[in-house]
């Protein structure tokens, strides 16, 4: 499989509302015009697919309606946002990029971004 370098940040801290954003950048060896981006989560040696989207250059990056991911693309960068995260979702989130068209097909897998999610402390009841 023709390999391609994919870069992503090592660590990201999710916001108090459970939102984490990071950039996934790929070094396109050719003239990529259709790209598929998949976010994988690795935890306890198990890998699961979080979300995926295929987009044409110049077109919007659209995930399925019920996806927890949103994103935008600019050149060889994809800005990914994952929402609705809780402490139990802490883990390594890997960016996988496939250059689908034109041929030849290229595949690149990042080293992963460790996303830390801290559930907010519940507000204490106030007694007056």
């Amino acid at each position: 499989c023709k390999a391609m370098h994919v870069a992503q940040p090592a660590v990201v801290l999710a916001s108090s509302r459970g939102i984490a954003s990071f950039v996934c950048e790929y070094a396109s060896p050719g003239k990529a015009t259709e790209v598929r981006v998949t976010v994988l989560r690795q935890a306890d040696s198990q890998v699961t697919e979080v979300c995926a989207a295929t987009y044409m250059m110049g077109n919007e990056l659209t995930f399925l309606d019920d996806s927890i991911c949103t994103g935008t693309s600019s050149g060889n960068q994809v800005n990914l946002t994952i929402q609705g995260l809780r402490a139990m979702d802490t883990g390594l989130y890997i960016c996988k990029v496939e250059l689908m068209y034109p041929p030849p097909y290229y595949l690149g897998i990042g080293n992963g971004t460790q996303i830390y999610v801290i559930d907010p402390e519940p507000c204490p009841d106030s007694d007056f």
Epitope: T33, E34, T54, M56, M57, G58, N59, P103, P104
Partner: antibody, heavy 120, light 112 residues
């Protein structure tokens, strides 16, 4: 239903240029690449190139570089191919075709073809 | 460029009988991602080409199941289990593994 309707037959003189159109309907124009294919009289098929309707980005067969220029007008869902410096061996039927990602970028819908005849 | 070679050039078939068309590529079309980038198109007389098969063995929407395709990385076969009159035309194999996309020279299927 999906349709690609091409402009009519052209008779042109050697050395001249011609611009063929391909009007798409029945789907979102910017969601699919458009390819162009040449068919010489009684012969097989030759891929000329493709265009991304979103940004006008093209990929082309080196054999046709300097011969064919591909463009789009998103506002009217139309793709164009201009052929320059025409010679007798450019006489052929030219097809536009839509690529479909679900079919791993096969050409799933084709225009009816435009016959270009180069004759003095 | 990848060269696609088809045989035979012409194939006369009796209706109801099976037919087989061969296609050979100058380079393996089986990618390490598991996909074989081989396609079959049919051009009926006086018409534009139409897609029959994608990814070597998958039938496009609306294609009758009497059509099937199989092969290795470089040798492919399109089979029609029982030829019907509407199957006449020129069959082309094509590759989409790398640019430029290339087609075979075509096989003309005709009714005896």
């Amino acid at each position: 239903q999906v349709q690609l309707v091409q402009s009519g037959a052209e008779v042109v003189k050697p050395g001249a240029s011609v611009k063929i159109s391909c009007k798409a309907s029945g789907y979102k124009f910017t969601d699919h690449f458009i390819n162009w294919v040449k068919q010489n009289p009684g012969q097989g098929l030759e891929w000329i190139g493709d265009i991304n309707p979103n940004n006008g980005g093209t990929n082309s067969n080196q054999k046709f570089e300097g011969k064919a220029t591909l463009t789009v007008d998103k506002s009217i869902s139309t793709a164009y191919m201009e052929l320059r410096r025409l010679r007798s061996d450019d006489t052929a039927v030219y097809y536009c075709a839509r690529l479909r990602r679900e079919y791993f970028y096969a050409m799933d819908y084709w225009g009816q073809g435009t016959l270009v005849t180069v004759s003095s | 460029d990848i060269v696609m070679t088809q045989s035979p050039l012409s194939l006369p078939v009796t209706p109801g009988e099976p037919a087989s068309i061969s296609c050979r590529s100058s380079k393996s079309l089986l990618h390490s991602n598991g996909i074989t980038y081989l396609y079959w198109y049919l051009q009926k007389p006086g018409q534009s080409p139409q897609l029959l098969i994608y990814q070597m063995s998958n039938l496009a929407s609306g294609v009758p199941d009497r059509f099937s395709s199989s092969g290795s990385g470089t040798d492919f076969t399109l089979k029609i289990s029982r030829v019907e009159a509407e199957d006449v035309g020129v069959y082309y194999c094509a590759q989409n593994l790398e640019l430029p996309l290339t087609f075979g020279g075509g096989t003309k299927l005709e009714i005896k």
